[in-house]
């Protein structure tokens, strides 16, 4: 069964910077990745970035840069411009649309006790959905 993993990492050098890493474990080719925050895509979440393997990547503030790390994993850098850090308690979700499997989504967040530079474990929150 395909699986999506999500890691949220606070940058050690800049406490206002976070990076979300997501990956797809499974056969098939990825046709689109959507990164949302505040919940899953279509269920209260707000899209922050869309990545297509050949058409390119797009992101919207507070996301700074979305990029493909490998053919099956992506990263999204976020810049927290506010004085407080809303990212610390936020859920980030990655939805991978793949052929022929369909869509698979998983969510993750930074653990409350995280020190800078440490990342959330790559265990997906159990919102794995196949559309």
């Amino acid at each position: 069964t395909p699986e999506v993993w999500v890691q949220v990492q606070m940058e050690a050098t800049e406490l206002s910077s976070f990076t979300v890493h997501c990956g797809f474990l499974g056969p098939g080719s990825i046709s689109l990745v959507t990164v949302s925050w505040g919940g899953p895509d279509g269920a209260g979440g707000t899209k922050l970035a869309v990545l297509h393997p050949e058409l390119g990547t797009r992101q919207w503030a507070p996301a700074r840069q979305a990029r493909w790390e490998t053919q099956s994993s992506i990263s999204l850098a976020l810049e927290d411009s506010g004085a407080s850090s809303p990212f610390a308690n936020t859920t980030f979700c990655c939805k991978f649309a793949s052929f022929p499997e369909g869509s698979w989504e998983s969510c993750g967040s930074l653990p409350p006790s995280s020190d800078p530079g440490l990342s959330a474990p790559p265990t997906p929150v159990p919102i794995l959905r196949a559309d």
Epitope: G42, T46, K47, V50, P53, L55, G56, W60, W68, Q71
Partner: antibody, heavy 114, light 113 residues
Framework: EVQLQQSGPEVVKPGASVKISCKAS????????INWVKQSHGKSLEWIGD????????NYNQKFKGKATLTVDKSSGTAFMGLRSLTSEDSAVYYC???????WGQGTSLTVSS | DIVMTQSPSSLSVSAGEKVTMSCKSS????????????LAWYQQKPGQPPKLLIY???TRESGVPDRFTGSGSGTDFTLTISSVQAEDLAVYYC?????????FGGGTRLEIK
Amino acid sequence: EVQLQQSGPEVVKPGASVKISCKASGNTFTDYFINWVKQSHGKSLEWIGDINPDNGGTNYNQKFKGKATLTVDKSSGTAFMGLRSLTSEDSAVYYCATLYFDYWGQGTSLTVSS
Amino acid sequence: DIVMTQSPSSLSVSAGEKVTMSCKSSQSLLNSGNQKNYLAWYQQKPGQPPKLLIYGASTRESGVPDRFTGSGSGTDFTLTISSVQAEDLAVYYCQNAHSSPYTFGGGTRLEIK
């Protein structure tokens, strides 16, 4: 089938402002990230910016910052582009297109003339 | 900004001939992470909006005839029409889909003799 329907041609005076609309149909509106593109007469294409209908987030081509303002109305499934302080240089056909430019509106002709 | 330069600016050929047009970018459009080139080609017929033909430098959009072929990598790209038809009369644009602003080339106008 995705369709983008743009508002009709505009003829305005220099210094005025205008608002062009682009209504999306055929899918959930929040799936439509809308680009705006300028094509001056007989010239190439220029990307103006894009808007995320989920939260109204925008990205602009630096060249059009202060000239163009992109907004969305989720309830009607419509994206808008406002253009201000118009001059003859703004006379062009303006297109809306989906996120990866795979679907385009029919274009809106803007003529700035006194 | 990435500058896209197309050549020639226009060409005139007879139906059935093979046509090649070039597009060069001022910076590489290759994404090192997934080894994909973020370059697109569009066809714009008179009085119509542009139509996406090719993306990822070489992938044909659904419904595009297989006489259209995109190739190239990094900064040098080519659009080839293997056997030009009368309906291919149009201006062809390449576009940087790699980074904002998403710049277009100046276009190549294809005329049919």
